[in-house]
């Protein structure tokens, strides 16, 4: 389990010809909000899938009223992160769909009207626990700048949030802010605990007890909007509403490792690899002899009888580093087949197999596809305790006998064409119609009464889902 987080930094007119001055129509003021949709996988053939990893809707942004003489600005945005919780494993590869909606606040029959301003679809690879990824995307004449990351929520850890970790009370040699894990992984996991009261929305920490602010926020707990900001080179002024850009300096900036140690970033923190003769979180401890017991995890110390002669640690299987302080992640080689869960016990690896599989590496299949038929070009896949069919695109159900085309129900009215795009169904309306399902006739004056709920678009706009 974990959370996908999206931070919108700016939304405004893009460069180049045809850049709009205002997101609002001539009918008066409007405000923006965003919708994010996550789908697993990168495949173009995943057209039918809903937002299987989850979706989220932002709060409404501040009201925007166009100033006729003013330059086209970055638009006022909703505060805070968009967070999409996911229950299962983080897939690593995913499609990210961000929609920018406007809510028109002028005199509307039946209340406010919503319409889709822009939509970007990104297919990405991302490991959970990694740093913020930044992106700039154009959608038509608009430009959207945003950052995103996926993070696990305890007890889940790892790049896919599939390994389980629970705190133990026994003392350990884990560094400050890190806790040992149980049941079987004897390793130090978990993100640092930030200073008490540090803003969840506008603050973050890379060391335990600190509170660092996202650009655009200040104060000891990152609760005070900053009046001005450089926005790390982003176009336009910063404002308290934009949240601006994400953490600037990385944890290894300025190399926190002393005495020639080399720094590598880890999720939410850093790790120093120390030269011989030094150890500690930042390689700050020197003058160490074997008598000081510098070799962790049962490592054997050789030499180093006095402070001037270097010692050498001979590490037991499963550990490495100049002080045997690092666990070798033997599970990263994915030795368990057929979706088995890898457990590194230190002295050995163990695979916990999914139902239907057995063997030291879950290599034996207990199911049998013999005599099982999958219709419409589907193929039988063994596993999960019973046979299942992997269906050809356009079919679904246990035996691939059901039509799974998102366009099968003919959702696009009045002769509109439905396309099974990887990001979801897309309607292309016949001339003279508009709306999310081409349901509204375009009036002779080129406008149509839109429903008072999303999605409704300008005439001639594609309909996107």
């Amino acid at each position: 389990a974990g959370v996908f987080e999206l931070q919108i930094h700016s939304f405004g007119p893009g460069p180049g010809p045809g850049a709009p001055r205002s997101p609002c129509s001539a009918r008066g003021p409007c405000r923006l909000f965003f919708r994010v949709c996550l789908k697993p996988g990168l495949s173009e053939e995943a057209a039918e899938s809903p937002c299987a990893l989850g979706a989220a809707l932002s709060a409404r942004g501040p009201v925007y009223t166009e100033q006729p003489e003013a330059p086209a600005p970055d638009l006022p945005l909703p505060n805070g992160l968009l967070q999409v919780p996911f229950r299962d494993a983080w897939p690593g590869t995913f499609s990210l769909i961000i929609e920018t909606w406007r809510e028109e606040l002028g005199d509307q029959i039946g209340g406010p009207a919503w319409s889709l301003l822009a939509r970007v679809t990104r297919r990405r690879r991302l490991a959970a626990g990694g740093p913020w990824a930044r992106d700039i995307q154009r959608a038509g004449a608009w430009e959207l700048r945003f950052s995103y990351r996926a993070r696990c929520e305890l007890p889940a850890v790892g790049t896919a949030c599939t390994r389980l970790c629970r705190p133990r009370s026994a003392p350990s040699r884990c560094g400050p802010g890190l806790r040992p894990c149980a049941p079987l992984e004897d390793e130090c996991e978990a993100p640092p605990v930030c200073r008490a009261g540090c803003s969840l929305e506008h603050g973050f920490c890379e060391q335990p007890g600190e509170c660092r602010c996202l650009e655009g926020w200040t104060g000891p707990l990152c609760t005070v909007p900053a009046s001005t900001s450089s926005c790390l080179g982003l176009r336009g002024p910063s404002s308290a509403t934009t949240g601006c850009l994400v953490p600037g300096p990385g944890p290894c900036d300025g190399n926190p490792c002393a005495n020639g140690g080399s720094c590598s970033e880890t999720p939410g923190s850093f790790e120093c690899t120390c030269p011989r003769g030094f150890y500690g979180l930042r390689c700050e401890v020197s003058g160490v002899t074997c008598a000081d017991g510098p070799c962790f995890n049962g490592g054997l110390c050789v030499g180093g009888a006095d402070p001037d002669s270097a010692y050498i640690c001979h590490c037991p299987p499963g550990f490495q580093g100049s002080n045997c302080e690092k666990r070798v992640d033997r599970c990263s080689l994915q030795p368990c087949r057929n979706g088995g869960l890898c457990l590194d016990l230190g002295h050995a690896l163990r695979c916990r197999c999914r139902a239907g599989f057995a063997g030291p590496r879950c290599e034996h299949n207990l199911d049998d596809c013999a005599g099982r038929a999958c219709a419409n070009g589907g193929t039988c896949v063994e596993g999960g305790g019973a046979h299942r069919c992997s269906c050809a695109l356009g079919f679904g159900g246990r035996d691939c006998r059901e039509r799974a085309d998102p366009c099968a129900a003919r959702p696009c009215a009045h002769g509109g064409r439905c396309y099974a795009h990887f990001s979801g169904l897309v309607c292309a309306c016949a001339p003279g119609y508009m709306g999310s399902r081409c349901e509204f006739p375009v009036h002779p004056d080129g406008v149509s009464a839109l429903p008072a709920a999303p999605p409704g678009l300008r005439p001639g706009d594609p309909q996107r889902h």
Epitope: D405, C418, Y419, A420, S423
Partner: antibody, heavy 119, light 110 residues
């Protein structure tokens, strides 16, 4: 593996009808696409000829192609075909089949087949 | 008939140069952004670079970018590389289920 492959005669005589076939694999026409034909004369640019929409098998053609081009589908063979009547030397080109799945772009192309019109 | 006009039709540039190709349509494309860009090398089918005016197709280097809406669009190659020598085409989709291609821009490396 999602693929398209064009096939047909490499040489056609003037005034004859050219028939080309596009065989697809890795996807099913039960989903909704535009399957299109695009041609490219030697040393020239790309030219859209027409498409067939698999949702209802309706066809659309470039204005120059109306009356000369017919596109059809044979779902049982995972094929769709192009017929171009009354060919002349100006129809000598590489002919591509391509698939559109939304937002107006052809995301999947065949390798193309060269057709020469000559007596 | 709808016309898509690309300019220039030919350009010669050095490795590392920033290259811009424009595409102008006689009619607005569907939804204002249903325009795509392709790269074609001799003997190969076109390869999709950009769709929906500005979305980079997966696997395409980030030095390629697209912008524009309605009738005016631009393809930019930020830092030209030797492998970018090819012909580039814009292609629009229009109301009434009509497609059209631009005339192409041949990019040569100096």
């Amino acid at each position: 593996q999602v693929t398209l492959r064009e096939s047909g005669p490499a040489l056609v005589k003037p005034t004859q009808t050219l028939t080309l076939t596009c065989t697809f694999s890795g996807f099913s026409l039960s989903s909704s696409y535009d399957m299109g034909w695009v041609r490219q004369a030697p040393g020239q640019g790309l030219e859209w000829m027409g498409t067939i929409y698999t949702g209802d098998y309706s066809t659309d053609y470039a204005s120059w192609a109306k009356g000369r081009v017919t596109i059809s589908v044979d779902t049982s063979k995972n094929q769709f075909s192009l017929k171009l009547s009354s060919v002349t030397a100006a129809d000598t080109a590489v002919y591509y089949c391509a698939r559109h799945t939304g937002y107006g772009y052809f995301g999947l192309w065949g390798q193309g087949t060269l057709v020469t019109v000559s007596s | 008939d709808i016309q898509l006009t690309q300019s220039p039709s030919f350009l010669s540039a050095s490795v590392g140069d920033r290259v811009t190709i424009t595409c102008q349509s006689t009619e607005s494309v569907y939804g204002s952004d249903w325009l795509s860009w392709y790269q074609q090398k001799p003997g190969q089918p076109p390869k999709l670079l950009i769709y929906q005016a500005s979305n980079l197709e997966i696997g395409v280097p980030s030095r390629f970018s697209g912008s524009g809406s309605g009738t005016d669009f631009t393809l930019t190659i930020n830092s030209l590389e030797a492998e970018d020598a090819a012909t580039y085409y814009c292609q629009g989709y229009y109301s009434g289920y009509i497609y059209a291609f631009g005339g192409g821009t041949k990019v040569e490396i100096k």
